[in-house]
Amino acid sequence: AQGKEVVLLDFAAAGGELGWLTHPYGKGWDLMQNIMNDMPIYMYSVCNVMSGDQDNWLRTNWVYRGEAERIFIELKFTVRDCNSFPGGASSCKETFNLYYAESDLDYGTNFQKRLFTKIDTIAPDEITVSSDFEARHVKLNVEERSVGPLTRKGFYLAFQDIGACVALLSVRVYYKKCPELLQGLAHFPETIAGSDAPSLATVAGTCVDHAVVPPGGEEPRMHCAVDGEWLVPIGQCLCQAGYEKVEDACQACSPGFFKFEASESPCLECPEHTLPSPEGATSCECEEGFFRAPQDPASMPCTRPPSAPHYLTAVGMGAKVELRWTPPQDSGGREDIVYSVTCEQCWPESGECGPCEASVRYSEPPHGLTRTSVTVSDLEPHMNYTFTVEARNGVSGLVTSRSFRTASVSINQTEPPKVRLEGRSTTSLSVSWSIPPPQQSRVWKYEVTYRKKGDSNSYNVRRTEGFSVTLDDLAPDTTYLVQVQALTQEGQGAGSKVHEFQTLSPEGSGNLAV
């Protein structure tokens, strides 16, 4: 519905009786009268374009604000072309300025420029050129501005001329009201249009029967916009659970349909795996063996836990195991499947078993996995490990049974050492290595094998109990292939990668670290 206008000031309708203040008196703006169709037309005009430094003010009478919060100012005016005057009149302007001042009392003839705040510079869309002016074809411009929020009892408008040739024919000041309205199952009364501040222009609505404010929602309120039009509700009345909107009323859901909460949606048919509902139902109960998770919407079919993961494999790689599995064949009707991996280790000699979560390392946290693989490392050699992969979904917590699959694997080797070059010279290489701490107690010695690159006929071996060695008596500027292998009581562990390390050339001699 369009806004309703309430006029506070209408210069054109006042017939020259308003007696606005001009400053300086008589030398700038002045009231003029013209007769059109035997009716007097009044205007305020100024045209001191040939004189520089014009500062002419026209102030309205004091206007009582009443209930208005934002006012609209409609101006109708003419502006003459500066080229109508000799040499374009260097001091001539084609705009004027609009100001306002709020006050709780009428200052009468006490005019003070400093109390006024500029609203805008008013420029014409069309100027009146000489030929039009002399033919009495003046170009009438219409401009509108608004000001708000207003808080004092009343206000003045003022027009500042700085050297234009202007005639102000109409000044209309009004505010807007939003009309009475029934919308969104709420009734809104006629309301004064607000200012920019929404809290000053919001209006509470009254809900119709079986309509409510949704839980946690805001009261049904609409903004009465500055232009007197209602905007979209902030909050609204919605048909309560078990009811749907039919025209401007709320009607109970039919049997076999439901509506879970106060919302804009219509009643929905009961979903899969539910029992039929009575009239006005707010939900549909699940069939036996099917469930709803607390966060599931009532519109979702009832679901059940998944079956176990399908086809679990455990592949050993030194002191690591890669577990892979495929999703359950029955998802239970849900997509929120996650997997949990648990680990058990057993000593082959005693057969004693226990959890091993504290001693192993997973490639990602083993609970709430969404991918179907995980790598387990830091496994101890010569141990038997059993891994359990459980599939769960949003309703698994509602039943006591679990859906899982297990796989076992024996670890026979240590993890390969990680090798680093610590330093080098023309005739030596300093090498260090590391293996995971849980495996270190099982290592008897480390065996370092090295040979010249390209020489496959001979190689050298050094054994040490430590984690580093310096290889001496090497040829300068030569690349050597170096490998480190852990030796355990049971035999050889996994060997490291073969590394290529080069001694320094004679020119770059000296023991340089890398």
Partner: antibody, heavy 120, light 108 residues
């Protein structure tokens, strides 16, 4: 009947003073700007002074500035022109006139005129 | 800022006569025209674009162009013999309002 009736003219010596009055009737005196216009014998019209409706604004022609004072008493519907330091060139018929709109006219109602003669 | 009028103009009865008024202020503001007969106060004839107060015969009309304003009497009569003055707001800011020097119209 809308009219302006003037009084107070006469013969005065150079350097002397005189006060002219202009009594208004038939309209809302306090709503209009009022002017004094003079006409030297055998000459044209010369604007002298203006006063705003409430009496808070006044303007004077350069020839009388500092010597003449325009005033009004809206409770008595009367306009005044106090003339001091009169000179021979101030000799003229003085008219009061109403500005029909605004400050500067046009002058739609005129008094009958009163002669001021400055002579020794 | 001054307004300039011809000192005198004459017309035969029933003929049309035009009295002119020149001045820079007339680019900015309309002229008003006054008629003054001997021994009486001036009387408003024309103001604004071409407005006549009630009681003024329609043979009197006004017009303006650039720095010039004109009073035209179409079908002059003996009783129109009088002095005619133009008047305008002063756009220079020197004065508030200015009068022309007056034109004596003689109806032959």
């Amino acid at each position: 009947q809308v009219q302006l009736v003037q009084s107070g003219g006469g013969l005065v010596q150079p350097g002397g003073s005189l006060r002219l009055s202009c009594a208004a009737s038939g309209f809302t005196f306090s709503s209009y700007a009022m002017h004094w216009v003079r006409q030297a014998p055998g000459k044209g019209l010369e604007w002298v002074s203006v006063i705003s409706p409430a009496g808070n604004n006044t303007y004077y022609a350069d020839s009388v500035k500092g010597r003449f004072t325009i005033s009004r008493d809206n409770s008595k519907n009367t306009l005044y022109l106090q003339m001091n330091s009169l000179r021979a060139e101030d000799t003229a018929v003085y008219y009061c006139a109403r500005a029909s709109v605004g400050a500067t006219g046009p002058f739609d109602i005129w008094g009958q005129g009163t002669l001021v003669t400055v002579s020794s | 800022s001054e307004l300039t009028q011809p000192p005198s103009v004459s017309v035969a009865p029933g003929q049309t006569v035009t009295i002119t008024c020149q001045g820079d202020s007339l680019r900015s503001y309309y002229a008003s025209w006054y008629q003054q007969k001997p021994g009486t106060a001036p009387k408003l004839l024309i103001y604004g674009e071409n407005n006549r107060p009630s009681g003024v015969p329609d043979r009197f009309s006004g017009s303006s162009s650039g720095t010039s304003a004109s009073l035209t009497i179409t079908g002059a009569q003996a009783e129109d013999e009088a002095d005619y003055y133009c008047n305008s707001r002063d756009s220079s800011g020197t004065h508030l309002t200015v009068f022309g020097g007056g034109t004596k119209l003689t109806v032959l």
